[in-house]
């Protein structure tokens, strides 16, 4: 039954040049996750984690994106252009698609705090 919910790291901030973990978690469903897609604010695909085929990082992001932890994604060498929305899309059977949203703000300031909290959008 489509009873699942996506919990995400919500709104997060990180320093320019640093790294950040984007994390989504699907709960409250027995559905099997067949694939998780990670997309950037302009809808370009960053990476895919497929249950059978494993990780695929798209060429444009290979140098700055690392798979994991888990089904999450680590963005490295952050630039100001990385500010914006990120989406995790869970493709599951038999439920279909679940989608979570994370907003990342990249800050110039050296006092930028890396705040991450799980929330239901």
């Amino acid at each position: 039954m489509m009873t699942g919910t996506i919990e995400t790291t919500g709104n997060i901030s990180a320093k320019k040049g640093g790294s950040v973990i984007l994390q989504c978690h699907l709960s409250s469903t027995m559905a099997q996750v067949t694939q998780v897609n990670w997309e950037q604010h302009d809808h370009s695909l960053l990476a895919i984690r497929n249950a059978e085929l494993g990780w695929h990082i798209y060429p444009a992001f290979k140098d700055r994106v690392a798979p994991g932890p888990g089904l999450g994604l680590t963005l490295q060498s952050l630039t100001m252009n990385d500010t914006g929305e990120y989406f995790c899309t869970y493709h599951t059977y038999p439920d279909g698609t679940y989608r979570g949203r994370i907003f990342l703000e990249v800050l110039e300031s050296s006092v930028a705090e890396h705040s991450a909290r799980f929330q239901i959008p």
Epitope: M1, H91, Y93
Partner: antibody, heavy 123, light 107 residues
Framework: QLQLQESGPGLVKPSETLSLTCTVS??????????WGWIRQPPGKGLEWIGS???????FYNPSFKSRVTISVDTSKNQFSLKLSSVTAADTAVYYC???????????????WGQGTLVTVSS | DIQMTQSPSTLSASVGDRVTITCRAS??????LAWYQQKPGKAPKLLIY???SLESGVPSRFSGSGSGTEFTLTISSLQPDDFATYYC?????????FGGGTKVEIK
């Protein structure tokens, strides 16, 4: 326009293996949005879901068939296949392949179907 | 498995009639119910999903309602093209299961 076409022998002997292939045209079987299923309908009876597959090979089977069914996918040919072993006369049916797709957050539905192929199990 | 029971199994009606078909699930499926139309020698066609949402391109004379275990498909004014067999299907819990069908025939 997406089209699905079943192909395979129309006659299978008891105890043998039924093999069917579904060829998808007008769209890619490799889309992450879709699952691909097999449904059958014995003559004059209702519909029965056999199982479904994802482009990457993840499979989901009806427990009623699980011990003798195999569904596989060949993305290079845009095809997926059904094998049903140890068939009996009770497996005589029209076999349909279909696409399972979402409608927003509303689960997965059989929205495109092949025209079906009749498989008779008889010696 | 969830058993889906349709009634009636056969329904005789005339063009212009209002027709109602019932589908009962053996346990709650929330609103995860679809209706399909099948004509002789053809594949089923999706009409309604999530109990009451009309599939794109399906005439508005078709409507669905219900939740939990009791569902109905209504054709507000039967047209010649509507004489067919109708199936309900639950898609909330595996394995996916269908009702036994309701044949709508000309009176």
């Amino acid at each position: 326009q997406l089209q699905l076409q079943e192909s395979g022998p129309g006659l299978v002997k008891p105890s043998e293996t039924l093999s069917l292939t579904c060829t998808v045209s007008g769209g890619s079987i490799s889309s992450s949005l879709y699952y691909w299923g097999w449904i059958r309908q014995p003559p004059g009876k209702g519909l029965e879901w056999i199982g479904s597959i994802y482009y990457s090979g993840s499979t989901f089977y009806n427990p009623s068939f699980k011990s003798r069914v195999t569904i596989s996918v060949d993305t290079s040919k845009n095809q997926f296949s059904l094998k049903l072993s140890s068939v009996t006369a009770a497996d005589t049916a029209v076999y349909y392949c279909a696409r399972e797709a979402g409608r927003g957050t509303t689960g997965l539905l059989f929205d495109y179907w092949g025209q079906g192929t009749l498989v008779t199990v008889s010696s | 498995d969830i058993q889906m029971t349709q009634s009636p199994s056969t329904l005789s009606a005339s063009v212009g009639d209002r027709v109602t078909i019932t589908c009962r699930a053996s346990q709650s499926i929330s609103s995860w119910l679809a209706w399909y139309q099948q004509k002789p020698g053809k594949a089923p066609k999706l009409l309604i999903y999530k109990a009451s949402s009309l599939e794109s391109g399906v005439p508005s004379r078709f409507s669905g309602s219900g939740s939990g275990t009791e569902f109905t498909l209504t054709i507000s004014s039967l047209q010649p093209d509507d004489f067919a067999t109708y199936y309900c299907q639950q898609y909330g819990i595996l394995p996916r299961t269908f009702g036994g069908g309701t044949k709508v025939e000309i009176k």
